[in-house]
């Protein structure tokens, strides 16, 4: 045993750039820090056999898998992978370890399986072993957290039934409105499933596991905050769980708080108040109103009432299967080139929608924003002005949601030119959709200022580009042009844009730009 | 360089819960099959081993112990947490986490690296 | 739950003494047995995995042998770094037990 080498196995995950096959050897790119792998002498094997701890992986993951060898002297190696022998090519680290990698990028089913590499050293021969699956990741879940009441306590219990089993936190905060951000230093974050503190202001419990993170509000009617203009709307499924919590702030206990649903008591049971102190010995009240179980008649105005304050009322309405209620009418958008401007869709959803906003194939964050009427916004500014389609789609597990935005940039246009044997041709992309005339360049036009007025075919918005129209027109040559300069011009209301080309031969041709605004 | 650090407060009041987090570096549980998992050791007496949690969330408890114990991880922070409530001074013990790795050829080598473990006393 | 019982519960030896000590399963673990050796105020140390591979690093004077429900170390030629307490642990199934150690003490 003293006389085998010591071995390491490490796997370093990539977050990815590119896409290609498996490489064996060192490749530039943003790794996370190297994970040992256990690698240890494998019981009861003919020869010597290393094996590392089974590597799981995501689908489309990139990794490397590394073998650090203390051994004297120079190593040889050869991976193999399916029957098939693999390049490998060992380097030496600083500390003078035989180093001997294998990348794997854009995992696929193909690349899932055992992976050996064969070392030969001065000393001895050993086998390693990796063994690389794909993990499941389709049975992974992560549900929004729903509240129960505890059992004999005043408190809460947050409950996200996900899998892999996720990370529960409360997230408090007792200012208002904006400085209740995520981030903001008035935020209180536990990482327990079980609140006490109910009486903050803002309350929300988060779950979070390989998938995400999820949160749910704690729906409160405060009835010291002047009303909402519109009604606040509390939307659930048929068999979800019901809270509401109302919450008051008076100089001294002579006050109470009920909850009625559409002018009728709650029933005992459905109901539970707290009570305390705050510093400046002001008496707070919040009382719940909680149905473990919704159903459809569980529908209607839900009023907290105050012997102290004016009531308050929250319309709570039970459907049978989530929505997203939007208008999905594709939209137009012409804008300036530095002009500032965003995308926008409006939207009434339950549950919440998980969104994306899609240009040119690649997907940016999506964020949203409730509003005070119950509707909720997403917002999309980062087009960088590049004209196209734009992209806004959003799920909830019940419903699915798409909505198509063009935006075109105003500019005058850019010609590009290309001519064949038989004809030439031009090309813009200027917007709006440019105009095209051909000139001739002869000794009684130097100027190029005679027109060309056969053989010319416009076709407007031939390619569309991610929605990005090109407008191009062509010249048809005859055989006593051969030999003449042409002129194309592309003209919008922003400005003329013009190209000069040698009708000669075929191939791609030095130009001549001439810009006329 | 792979290590194992258990942190947690060294002196307990009989019926409270006991939270112990076991931090790790130089290995995940993301990527690679492994578990972690808890021992404990009272002064002067031998090792007895409370839970494990595998790198896919299954977790296993000690029979006597089952009712008490929680397990769970949070992989992005490279932490397992273990929670004994309802403790007593015979739960007085120093507290261990170690690694296991899972090989693909069905065996497993038990426990590779350990933590220095952290002394937890349960007095009034 | 498997029972795991390890003798002797205490040892006296000498520097040089070939020393055994055996550990025995309630029913068939395989070979699914480790060793381990503690000192005190420190965290065990693996010296033997599946019943009879010897740790990486781990002097070859320990030796692990056994398969089924009967299992020993055997350190050939102790040193006097080698007194310490000794535990098998069976990883067959859950729950994982300890056998009760050995003390292995200076003569």
């Known amino acids: 045993n003293q006389d085998l080498p010591v071995i390491k196995c490490v796997l370093i995950n990539h977050k990815n750039n590119d896409s290609s096959v498996g490489k064996s050897s060192s490749y530039p790119m943003v790794s996370e820090s190297p994970e040992d792998l256990g690698c240890a002498l494998r019981p009861q094997s003919a020869g010597t056999v290393y094996e590392a701890a089974t590597v799981e992986v995501d689908v489309s993951a990139s990794i490397t898998l590394q073998v650090l060898v203390d051994t004297p002297g120079n190593i040889s190696c050869l991976w193999v992978f399916k029957h098939s022998s693999l390049n490998c090519q060992p380097h030496f680290d600083v500390q003078n370890r035989g180093v001997v990698s294998m990348v794997i990028l854009k995992m696929t089913e193909t690349q899932a399986g055992e992976y050996l590499l064969f070392i030969q050293s001065e000393a001895t021969n050993y086998t390693i072993l990796f063994t690389v699956s794909i993990r499941n990741t389709l049975l992974f879940t992560l549900r929004r957290p729903y509240f129960r009441k505890m059992e004999n306590q005043d408190a809460l219990v947050c409950i996200s039934e996900s899998v892999p089993e996720p990370i529960v936190e409360w997230v408090l905060c007792d200012s208002q409105g904006e400085s209740c951000k995520e981030e903001s230093p008035a935020v209180v974050k536990k990482e327990e499933k079980v609140l006490h503190e109910l009486f903050g202001t803002d309350i929300r419990c988060c779950a979070r596991n390989e998938l995400g993170r999820e949160c749910t509000r704690l729906f409160t009617i405060d009835l010291n905050q002047t009303p909402q203009t519109t009604l606040p709307q509390l939307f659930l499924k048929v068999g979800e769980p019901l809270w509401i919590r109302c919450k008051a702030v008076h100089v001294n206990h002579g006050f109470g708080l009920t909850w009625e649903l559409e002018n009728k008591a709650l029933e005992e049971g459905s109901y539970f108040e707290m009570s305390t102190y705050s510093t400046n010995r002001t008496m707070i009240r919040i009382l719940f109103a909680f149905v473990s179980s919704v159903a459809r008649n569980d529908t209607g105005y839900y009023t907290c009432s105050s012997s102290k304050h004016p009531s308050q009322s929250a319309l709570v309405t039970i459907v049978e299967k989530g929505f997203i209620n939007a208008t999905n009418s594709s939209e137009d958008y012409e804008i300036d080139q530095y002009e500032e401007f965003c995308f926008s869709v409006r939207f009434k959803a339950y549950p919440q929608i998980r969104c994306t906003w899609t240009f040119s194939r690649k997907s940016f964050p999506c964020e949203q924003k409730g509003l005070d009427d119950g509707y909720s916004v997403s917002k999309f500014c980062n087009h960088k002005h590049q004209p196209g389609e734009y992209i806004f789609h959003a799920e909830n597990g019940d419903a699915q949601f798409t909505k198509m935005f063009t935006l075109n940039i105003r500019r005058k246009p850019q010609v590009l030119a290309e001519a064949s044997a038989s004809q030439a041709s031009c090309s813009s992309d200027g917007y709006p959709l440019p105009s095209w005339t051909w000139k001739k360049c002869s000794d009684k036009s130097p100027n190029c200022t005679e027109d060309i007025p056969e053989g010319v075919w416009n076709r407007k918005a031939n390619r569309k580009v991610f929605g990005q129209w090109v407008s191009s027109s062509t010249l048809n040559m005859s055989e006593a042009m051969k030999g003449f300069l042409v002129k194309c011009c592309a003209y919008n209301s922003l400005g003329t844009s013009c190209e000069t080309i040698l009708l000669n031969s075929p191939g791609p041709f030095p130009f001549i730009q001439d810009s006329i605004s | 360089q792979v290590t194992l650090k258990e942190s947690g407060p060294t002196l307990v009041k009989p019926t409270e819960t006991l939270t112990l987090t076991c931090t790790f570096s130089g290995f995940s549980l993301r990527y690679a099959r492994m578990g972690v998992s808890w021992i404990r050791q009272p002064p002067g007496k031998a090792l007895e081993w409370l839970a494990h949690i595998f790198s896919n969330d299954e977790k296993s408890y000690s029979t006597s112990l089952k009712s008490r114990l929680t397990i769970s991880k949070d992989t992005s922070k490279s932490q397992v947490v273990l929670t004994l409530t309802n403790m007593d001074p015979v739960d007085t013990a120093t507290y261990f986490c170690?690694?296991?790795?899972?090989?693909?050829?069905?065996?497993?080598?038990?426990?590779?690296?350990w933590g220095q473990g952290t002394m937890v006393t349960v007095s009034s | 739950d498997i029972q795991m019982t390890q003798s002797p519960s205490s040892l006296s030896a000498s520097v040089g003494d070939r020393v055994t000590i055996t550990c025995r399963a309630s029913q068939d673990i395989r070979n699914d047995l480790a060793w381990y050796q503690q000192k005190p105020g420190k965290a065990p140390k693996r010296l033997i995995y599946a019943a009879s591979s010897l740790q990486s690093g781990v002097p070859s004077r320990f030796s692990g042998s056994g398969s089924g429900t009967e299992f020993t170390l055997t350190i050939s030629s102790l040193q006097p770094e080698d007194f310490a307490t000794y535990y098998c642990l069976q990883h067959n199934s859950y729950p994982l037990t300890f056998g009760g150690g050995t003390k292995l003490e200076i003569k």
């Open positions: 170690a690694r296991m790795p899972e090989y693909s050829s069905g065996w497993s080598g038990a426990f590779d690296i």
